[in-house]
Structure formats: structure tokens, C-alpha cells
Interface confidence: low
Amino acid sequence: EVEKTACPSGKKAREIDESLIFYKKWELEACVDAALLATQMDRVNAIPFTYEQLDVLKHKLDELYPQGYPESVIQHLGYLFLKMSPEDIRKWNVTSLETLKALLEVNKGHEMSPQVATLIDRFVKGRGQLDKDTLDTLTAFYPGYLCSLSPEELSSVPPSSIWAVRPQDLDTCDPRQLDVLYPKARLAFQNMNGSEYFVKIQSFLGGAPTEDLKALSQQNVSMDLATFMKLRTDAVLPLTVAEVQKLLGPHVEGLKAEERHRPVRDWILRQRQDDLDTLGLGLQG
């Protein structure tokens, strides 16, 4: 806690500027008016304050806004955001995507901190759903963001938001998450033609049911082995040899290299040896 001391004569801050970096902590507390600070928050980031000095500035804002900062202040917090605790952030009402971007920018290049997680949670809850622009922003800063959500949270993602999802955003998703995302992707991309549809849906196929895989096998999609290996085992098992051959196209020869791994191993065991022999790959059921 900073002691309340009178501001020395002539040191009262008229504006937030570079001269303040020479103020001691107690002088900042005594000589900087909290309301002035709030209206000139955008200047704080341009001034090389020490973290100790930033502590004082935060303390002044906390006193001015005990119920939580207004968005006009939040948007210009800059590096002061790194001083906020999740408890501080829970008091905020952040509605502007620009504000969210400004604060994520401060944390760019770092792992998602508890502060950022709380900020995102507050923002998404305030919006009621994870809309496309928000998802676009979050996955740009945190490619793994989507896969950090629970299946329940993912259920609030509208199909229109799926257009913002890039293949790398799904790299760490598990089958339960893809089970939720796949039907949304199918709906989002339903009006695309065959080859374009496959390019878009490919990353989501870990949630696809057997009947959709059968349908894809009729469309000359040439699925690569990496995608095939991520399919649900229970969805692959009912596929016939002919269907898998059509689904993989020229990549079918890759089954040999994967014959000991799921889902290929389990699928091979379900097939008749005569059918497997038609592939000419030496697969043993």
C-alpha cells in the first residue's frame, strides 16, 4: 500500500507525459490525478514506466473504479494489462472486438495466461456465442484456442463461424471435440462443390460418421493417409475395401506402412482376405 503524502510544490501532473518516469512511486501516487490518468491512458504505453511505477498507476485506477474499469480505459491499458489479476478482469464488461484485440496484442507470443483466459471467457459470455469475427481473432492469436474448449463450449459455436477455422487450429482437437465441430462444418460448407468441399471439410473429418465417409468415397477426393489415420475407428470399420480404395485414391498404397496402427489395423482385421488381396499391397487380415 502506497502511503498518502502531499504532492511537492510544482510537481502536480498536468498531463501524462515522459517527465513522469522520473517520479518516485510516492510522487506518482500523490501528484497524478486518477481521472487524468483515465482520460490519457493511451499515452501510458508510449512512456517507459517501470513495473513498479505501473503498480502505482494500477492502484490509482483501482481506487477510481472499484466496481471495474470502463471499456474506454480497458482498451488503452496496453502493458498495464499484464498487471491485472483474473479477479480484476472478472469485474470488466468488454464488448468491443477492438478492445479484445488490443489486449491480446499485449500478450502476443506468450502462452495463454490466466488473465487472457479470463478476458476471453468474459468477452465470449458477453456476446452469448463464439461468433465468426471473435473466433477469427482468437485463433489468429492462439491457434490452439478452439481445441482448448470443452465439447459443451464448442456447441455454442454457430456453423457460420466455422469459416474462420484454419486446419492448424484443429491440430490438438480430440475426437470428442471433432464430433461437435464436424456437423457444424458439414452445414457451413454444404453449398460448396465436391473438390472445394473436401478441402474445407478435410480437417474436421475426425468427427465424420461412416455414411459420410461412404459418400466421400464416391467423389474422387483422394484423401491422404494423415487424414485417414485421424478418422474415428468406429466410422472406418464398416467401410468395404472398394470404398477405402476409392476414398484414398492414389494414397491407398500408404495403407501398407500403417497396417499396424489404428484405425487401419482394426479395419484390416474386419475384411475378407480375398478383398484385401485385390489391393495388391500384401495386407494380411
Epitope: A140, W163, R166, P167, V199, V221, S222, H251
Partner: antibody
């Protein structure tokens, strides 16, 4: 260091054919989708065609569809563009480019090869 | 097809200036936008992808912003080597399309 080297350009008469090649080095060629982009003299960039990592999926601009064919030979680290029924408006520098991790943007480009269609 | 409109088509600036180029798409493309720099008689070079992500090795004076339909490329402290033509490109859907280009010239 990634290098893309185009070849096969030259002067051809309208209605004629050319085959462009793009030899790639310094990258795992089979792991990246590739594309051809062209630039007519004094004009901007125009995307021509793209191909998936396996070669199983191809895309074309409407201006070349049915006349141009993109292909790749992953064993030779080479991308191709077969151009048939060439027209004067196909005159351009043709660049091959490698798709980056961000799907659809191109992080490495070749230096280009000039195709001139004229009688 | 998605049309990409760049403005201005050309501009004159001095070393040290802050330069802003805008790119507008005819329909929403999320953040699926790239920026390229091209110098005379040279191949294009990638600057920005995903609207705001800096390509490896590109100086930090280049920055990109925007999402949806409106995008901006900013060069914060123009250097002699930055005089070139800049193109935006959408990769939300095929056919991939480029903007018409913005030529940045010495004042």
C-alpha cells in the same frame, strides 16, 4: 534455403502449346501445395492454378480452365503447367509459388519465366 | 469470384513517413488475407499472412490489420528499400484473387 526455379518459357504462336516446369529445392516438396501465378507486362498479379500435395486436387482460374493443366512429380520435386491453345492474353511472366502453413498464402516464389504468345 | 480493391493505386512518400494501404474485399473473408511486396523485375515477396501475422524475416515496421472486408497494410517508418508495389490477396475461397496493387514511389 528454399529455391523455386521456373523454366520452359519462350515465344509461341497463338494456338500453340508450352510446358512450364518449376524445380524445387531446399524443402520437402511433397508436403506443400503449389500454385502458378502470372503477371502480364505492366499489370498486376493473377492467380492461374493450384495443386494439392498429392496432386489429386487441382484448381484453375476460369480464364485458363480447359486449356491449362497443372501437375506435379513429387519424386522429381517438380511442378508443371501444360499450356495449350495459347492466346495473346496469356502473355505474361509465370511464377510458381509454394503455399505456406497459412493455407492459401504463398511464402516462397520463383523468379518467373516469360511466356510470349505472338504471331 | 471475390473482388479485391486496393487504394490508393499509387502514392508518393518520403523516407521516414508512415504509409497506409487499404484493401477491401467484395465479401467477408475473415482473416484469410495476405500482403506481398514486389520490386521491378523481381518476384513478389510475402510480407503478411492471416491479415496480421508477419512473415518470418520481414521487418517489424510492416504491420497488417483488419478482418471481414476491410484490411490495412501499414509501413510505420518508410525506408529506401520499401519503395515498391504492394498487393493484397484473399485466400478465403477459390479462385484466389489479388488486389490491383499500390505503387509506393519516392516523393
Amino acid at each position: 534455403e528454399v529455391q523455386l526455379l521456373e523454366s520452359g518459357g519462350g515465344l509461341v504462336q497463338p494456338g500453340g502449346s508450352l510446358r512450364l516446369s518449376c524445380a524445387a529445392s531446399g524443402l520437402t516438396f511433397r508436403s506443400y501445395a503449389m500454385t502458378w501465378v502470372r503477371q502480364a507486362p505492366g499489370k498486376g498479379l493473377e492467380w492461374v492454378s493450384g495443386i494439392s500435395v498429392s496432386g489429386g486436387i487441382t484448381y484453375y482460374a476460369s480464364s485458363v480452365k480447359g486449356r491449362f493443366t497443372i501437375s506435379r512429380d513429387n519424386s522429381k520435386n517438380t511442378l508443371y503447367l501444360q499450356m495449350n491453345s495459347l492466346r495473346a492474353e496469356d502473355t505474361a511472366v509465370y511464377y510458381c509459388a509454394k503455399r505456406g502453413a497459412a493455407v492459401g498464402s504463398f511464402d516462397y516464389w520463383g523468379q518467373g519465366t516469360l511466356v510470349t504468345v505472338s504471331s | 469470384d471475390i473482388q479485391m480493391t486496393q487504394s490508393p493505386s499509387s502514392l508518393s512518400a518520403s523516407v521516414g513517413d508512415r504509409v497506409t494501404i487499404t484493401c477491401r474485399s467484395s465479401q467477408g473473408i475473415g482473416s484469410w488475407l495476405a500482403w506481398y511486396q514486389q520490386k521491378p523485375e523481381k518476384a513478389p515477396q510475402s510480407l503478411i499472412y492471416a491479415a496480421s501475422s508477419l512473415q518470418s524475416g520481414v521487418p517489424s515496421r510492416f504491420s497488417g490489420s483488419g478482418s471481414g472486408t476491410d484490411f490495412t497494410l501499414t509501413i510505420s517508418n518508410l525506408q529506401p528499400e520499401d519503395f515498391a508495389t504492394y498487393y493484397c490477396q484473399q485466400y478465403n475461397s477459390y479462385p484466389l484473387t489479388f488486389g490491383g496493387g499500390t505503387k509506393v514511389e519516392i516523393k
